[in-house]
Interface confidence: low
């Protein structure tokens, strides 16, 4: 008679992540009797998943009645699959004795775990930064099997190129991680703008997953001054104006100086907001010219979201003011920026 | 930035080929570079591709254990593990767009590959 | 398994006449489509990727859109230049990196 045969038909099988894998084995013979089991690996350090003479193996369930006597069918099914039990998996016949000694093993069928990647999580620096300036955005995500996969980033659906990606680890692994690093130049449009990081994985069946970024918590776009002379208020009272434009975040104080003596200081807080998510905000100050003698250098000085303060001076010259009401002759902008 | 094919030539079936791609202007750890080929008269058909930074490959369907991809610090290598006449084709090396962005904005001028009796 | 299917195959227009070509996915590949335009002897030229973005030095005749299963190519204002084979090719993942069975084009 035709000596025995182990046959695994499967060279490889494919399981997604929690479901069961089915390995197949079957035998050309009864003879000679005795158990088969199944390991996972080859060699001294193999794992035994199944021996069907004894043994408490919860998660293995045999397809058909291996008990019966005339059975050639050893297949196995494998509940709960996790990327853990990714590996080469052995159908071996042992011949019976004491003790029973190995006759023949099948070909090996190879367990691939599909795995999904985690959320992608992206994380930007711990720093604002201002336009034109380059900023680095990390993407991390983990967990995922098998290894090929592709990720993308995109700046409000554009896009990007200027990026570098890792997959670890190199060699084999039941499970893998991805890290990907992009850089991204701001723009003072930027306030709305999102970051996106596109992970797309076998797995995912087409729907690839996304992380996002907001640009609100990485941009600071600083002010721009204007400082302006309003008509006269009253009798020797000139009314001047900081326009304070374009600056994200809101944090802003504002201090003025006559002839370098802080006058006043406010904080903003009835911003208006512009389209691009950008604020705006005025402050006035009433200067009485009748108490000053000589010219008065007015400045207007904004300390930005912790930043250095920049300022914006106006010159009053008060000698040549009329002290008619309603003239607006009084003063001249020779504005200068100071830092 | 250029690619350059080299190795093309005539073969008996089942004796194995090694195509190179050299890159110049451009460093490989930062690109994926794939194969393609193109039979006589017959449209593109993507081979697989090695990315920038690692030795991960990747290989279409029906080219796994057909083809084999290597690299070195400058050159990309292809090898026909064992040619049929089906194999006779141009092939080209192709850079990706970025690592990853698997388009290709720089091609080879390619190379034939003749399989024979 | 994912394919992408070109239609027609081939088709014939006159100088400053418009061609549509169409390129359809097995599945949804959101916009991670490219075109090439190849002449003989010659490799491939990269003309549009992301399904719509003009590549660098593509005149803007060529026109792509469309995203997820359906991606048409719209050569217009046709010039003798513009004879060639022309590929759409998916790059979402290797597993979908196909490209299509070509449509030539024909100029009169």
């Known amino acids: 008679e035709e000596e025995l045969q182990v046959i695994q038909p499967d060279k490889s099988v494919s399981v997604a992540a929690g479901e069961s894998a089915i390995l197949h084995c079957t035998v050309t013979s009864l003879i000679p009797v005795g158990p088969i089991q199944w390991f996972r690996g080859a060699g001294p350090a193999r794992e035994l998943i199944y021996n069907q003479k004894e043994g408490h193996f919860p998660r293995v369930t045999t397809v058909s009645e291996s008990t019966k006597r005339e059975n050639m069918d050893f297949s196995i099914s494998i509940s709960n699959i996790t990327p853990a039990d990714a590996g080469t998996y052995y159908c071996v016949k042992f011949r019976k004795g004491s003790p029973d000694t190995e006759f023949k093993s099948g070909a090996g069928t190879e367990l691939s775990v599909r795995a999904k990647p985690s959320a992608p999580v992206v994380s930007g620096p711990a720093a604002r930064a201002t336009p034109q300036h380059t900023v680095s955005f990390t993407c991390e995500s983990h967990g995922f099997s098998p290894r090929d996969i592709t990720l993308k980033w995109f700046k409000n659906g554009n896009e990007l190129s200027d990026f570098q990606t890792n997959v670890d680890p190199v060699g084999e692994s039941v499970s893998y991680s991805i890290h990907s690093t992009a850089k991204v130049v701001l723009t003072r449009e930027d306030v709305h703008s999102q970051v996106i990081c596109e992970v797309a994985h076998v797995t995912l069946q087409g729907d690839p997953l996304r992380g996002t970024a907001n640009l609100s918590e990485t941009i600071r776009v600083p002010p721009t001054l204007e400082v302006t002379q309003q008509p006269v208020r009253a009798e020797n009272q000139v009314n001047v104006t900081c326009q304070v434009r374009k600056f994200y975040p809101q944090r802003l104080q504002l201090t003025w100086l006559e002839n370098g003596n802080v006058s006043r200081t406010e904080t903003a807080s009835t911003v208006t907001e512009n389209k691009d998510g950008t604020y705006n905000w005025m402050s006035w100050l009433l200067v009485n010219v009748s108490a000053h003698r000589d010219d008065v250098k007015l400045t207007c000085q904004v300390e930005h979201d912790g930043q250095p303060a920049v300022s914006k001076s106006h010159d009053l010259k008060v000698s040549a003011h009329p002290k008619e009401q309603g003239s607006n002759t009084a003063a001249e902008n020779t504005g200068s920026n100071e830092r | 930035q250029s690619m350059e094919e080299s190795g093309g030539r005539l073969v008996t079936p089942g004796t194995p080929l090694t195509l190179t791609c050299t890159a110049s202007g451009f460093s490989l750890s930062n690109y994926g570079v794939s194969w393609v080929r193109q039979a006589p008269g017959k449209g593109l058909e993507w081979i697989g591709i090695?990315?920038?930074?690692?030795?991960i490959t990747a290989y279409a369907s029906w080219a796994k254990g057909r083809f084999t991809i290597s690299k070195t610090s400058t050159t990309v290598d292809l090898t026909i593990t064992s040619p049929t006449t089906e194999d006779t084709a141009t092939y080209f090396c192709a850079k990706s767009y970025t690592n990853g962005m698997d388009y290709y904005n720089i091609w080879g001028p390619g190379t034939l590959v003749t399989v024979s009796l | 398994a994912f394919d992408l299917t070109q239609t027609p195959s081939s088709v014939e227009a006159p100088v400053g006449g418009t061609v549509i070509i169409k390129c359809q996915a097995s599945q949804s590949i959101s916009s991670y489509l490219a075109w090439y335009q190849q002449k003989p002897g010659q490799p491939p030229k990269l003309l549009i990727y992301?399904?719509?973005t003009l590549a660098s030095g593509v005149s803007s005749r060529f026109k792509g859109s469309g995203s997820e299963t359906q991606f048409p190519l719209t050569i217009s204002d046709l010039e003798s230049a513009d004879a060639a084979t022309y590929y759409c090719?998916?790059?979402?993942?290797?597993?979908?990196?196909?490209f299509g069975g070509g449509t030539e084009v024909v100029v009169k």
């Open positions: 992301s399904a719509s």
């Open positions: 090719q998916s790059y979402y993942g290797s597993r979908s990196n196909v």
């Open positions: 090695i990315y920038g930074g690692s030795d």
